[in-house]
Amino acid sequence: SAPGEDEECGRVRDFVAKLANNTHQHVFDDLRGSVSLSWVGDSTGVILVLTTFHVPLVIMTFGQSKLYRSEDYGKNFKDITDLINNTFIRTEFGMAIGPENSGKVVLTAEVSGGSRGGRIFRSSDFAKNFVQTDLPFHPLTQMMYSPQNSDYLLALSTENGLWVSKNFGGKWEEIHKAVCLAKWGSDNTIFFTTYANGSCKADLGALELWRTSDLGKSFKTIGVKIYSFGLGGRFLFASVMADKDTTRRIHVSTDQGDTWSMAQLPSVGQEQFYSILAANDDMVFMHVDEPGDTGFGTIFTSDDRGIVYSKSLDRHLYTTTGGETDFTNVTSLRGVYITSVLSEDNSIQTMITFDQGGRWTHLRKPENSECDATAKNKNECSLHIHASYSISQKLNVPMAPLSEPNAVGIVIAHGSVGDAISVMVPDVYISDDGGYSWTKMLEGPHYYTILDSGGIIVAAEHSSRPINVIKFSTDEGQCWQTYTFTRDPIYFTGLASEPGARSMNISIWGFTESFLTSQWVSYTIDFKDILERNCEEKDYTIWLAHSTDPEDYEDGCILGYKEQFLRLRKSSVCQNGRDYVVTKQPSICLCSLEDFLCDFGYYRPENDSKCVEQPELKGHDLEFCLYGREEHLTTNGYRKIPGDKCQGGVNPVREVKDLKKKCTSNFLSPEKQNSKSN
């Protein structure tokens, strides 16, 4: 069972008085509609609260969007609705917050009557002031900021025009018509697909992929017969229709679309899809849907060029296009991902990888947990994690799994212990080692959040009844103390804390209901007095990540290196602080076969670390297409895993020869590429 709130857990003395002095209530008199909350900037304390509406709506004649601003992490709010001229802000556009600490905010308003265009409200001073700008178009999507320059904005119009602003939305220019999808790339590059004939839908598979590197002065067609495209890490992907049939294949470019290679992935038919699950500068996780409406597919992991793929996980749960997958990057430990598979018996099971998709295993059964009714053997079972799919199925799961890069090793998730995910009411489990071991943390479903880089975990029960209590832990979820934050319980809607888990403030949102009226209310609690002192050297202990067997010389080695971290001792009640930086020390490991993936034409039989030739390619010359040239590969079957830093040890031989022959895996050869200038 989960740890109780007994005397043994009385870790923080006199906490009630300390928290009571730091609990701030704010009642919002006239909030209606959907409430959205955004932090503006990092460590600024600025929060915007906006009520938005879906359009069309009957309510338009009665009300308006309300905008509130806090500059003290939610302790006090000021009504600044007059700054947006009492306009309606559309739910689907919400608040577009600028990258980094730019202080920029764009609100997209609904303008009634046959106006020429939409309207935006722009702020570049952390929402202190807004400038109203009428647009020469009606926006279809939220304004997109260039990651490199927050003055550059991109938007699609309802007429499928691609509009760009170079002065933070003051002036707009239509740089292209008939655009389906547009995305910022690196260095202020814009990628977009266009249709030639009827519409985006009608031309699917016959779209062109364009690029502009100068905000629309000049263009280059970098792909034809495009179905869709995506960006991940340093890779540009396009799914391209095959010449002869209705199947399509993934092509990949690492030079912004100048040259392309065909990815060694299965082609897919009309009803199937590809999905980039995760990508970084080293590699990509790609999901390839199975034929038919199976609800599952296969995960492949790429090499460093995004071309050669290794099968990583079969029967990966991913409902139809745009549907749900439980694929989760555990950001608190390098190389760890969690997802779900659909078993032959249609039950759903959780799998975890600690080595970036090299091997997947079930999650270890938590200590002190019983196997539930789904388990055939009452002593042998696993933990199964509820994520997006469970939430979409309206199971009693208020939150997806949570991890934070600066709260090393900590993963919090709802789960059940058995042979598969259970529809019973879940409990909350925690891992302090990145998913290797788990403990039941709280009984029943909860909202949870990490504060002060893991120094505090806060939780609130998910209940249909009003609540007035939150729980907090200063020892990574082992012991919990409860705090009554109000005498009058509220219908709880969510916990809100500043992204990045560095804050010590938590806001509890909800509403009170009395006869005929309901009022939104927030309680912001500052935990600074609970963690009275700053952490010192003695408050940290050394921890080796990915450790499974200390007797193994290479214990802790993942992707060619091991990392030791300084971690807060569970007994230390102190502040990591806003400026806390994770202290880690890497050390390089010797190479073993585990540090290599199987090269083109090779595969790994199950439970074997050796790569063997694919039977159908035995004795054939290994020739494949790379950047439009035929290459001859001399290999004994291994290629170093992307991002692997091992040195010495095993060193398989590998050589690639340019055959000086053209080949046509490229769906677009350089001579077909065209450029034009505006």
Partner: antibody
């Protein structure tokens, strides 16, 4: 089977320093922390500090901070403890001990292998 | 640093007795507690780690319990070989030992 073998007994003058060695054999020295614990005649056990050979991360009990230096040499699987500014109260048996490990935490599981102890006598 | 208080400091018992030694931490240390046995002129020997886990090779008559601040070492039936001094040790702060409990023949 892992063994820790310590250097021989030492007699030192007050104000001088002593360096005790602890050589590991039969296990993966680098993956465990080595702690140093002392025991004065007729007294209890007192932790002085420890080191993790990988990376050489050392940490010390507050009482000994500035007076003790713990090092490790991975190539010879040997840990060292040097205590300076010796006084008569430092007369004790000094033990090195391997910290047991079940997870990534180096210091949480007790000391499962001990050296035979080195007697250090401080006398003028 | 976390202080460990062991009681009693001396305990007289006979072979076959059930013996209980208590250790209290000055603040919560979760389950990060170890118990050792030491005989005169010898190095300590680990009996229990993580409050209740028995070290391999240690007889099952030794058991540990507790979490937070209160811990107990129990010898269910005292054997002639068990007369020694016992120490608790916390491992969640900078390591500290209890003062020891000497178990002697009654």
């Amino acid at each position: 089977q892992v063994q820790l073998v310590q250097s021989g007994a030492e007699v030192k003058k007050p104000g001088s320093s002593v360096k005790v060695s602890c050589k590991a054999s039969g296990g993966t020295f680098r993956n465990y922390a080595i702690s140093w614990v002392r025991q004065a005649p007729g007294q209890g056990l007192e932790w002085m500090g420890g080191i993790i050979p990988i990376g050489g991360w050392a940490n010390y009990a507050q009482k000994f901070q500035g007076r003790v230096t713990i090092t490790a040499d991975e190539s010879t699987s040997t840990a060292y403890m040097e205590l300076s500014s010796l006084r008569s109260e430092d007369t004790a048996v000094y033990y090195c001990a391997r910290q047991g490990r079940k997870t990534g935490y180096y210091y949480y599981y007790g000391m499962d292998v001990w050296g035979q102890g080195t007697t250090v006598t401080v006398s003028s | 640093d976390i202080q460990m208080t062991q009681s009693p400091s001396t305990l007289s018992a006979s072979v076959g007795d059930r013996v209980t030694i208590t250790c209290r931490a000055s603040q919560s240390i979760s389950s990060w507690l170890a118990w050792y046995q030491q005989k005169p002129g010898k190095a300590p020997k680990l009996l229990i780690y993580k409050a209740s886990s028995l070290e391999s090779g240690v007889p099952s008559r030794f058991s540990g319990s507790g979490s937070g601040t209160e811990f107990t070492l129990t010898i269910s039936s005292l054997q002639p070989d068990d007369f020694a001094t016992y120490y608790c040790q916390q491992a969640d702060g900078h390591i500290t030992f209890g003062g020891g409990t000497k178990v002697e023949i009654k």
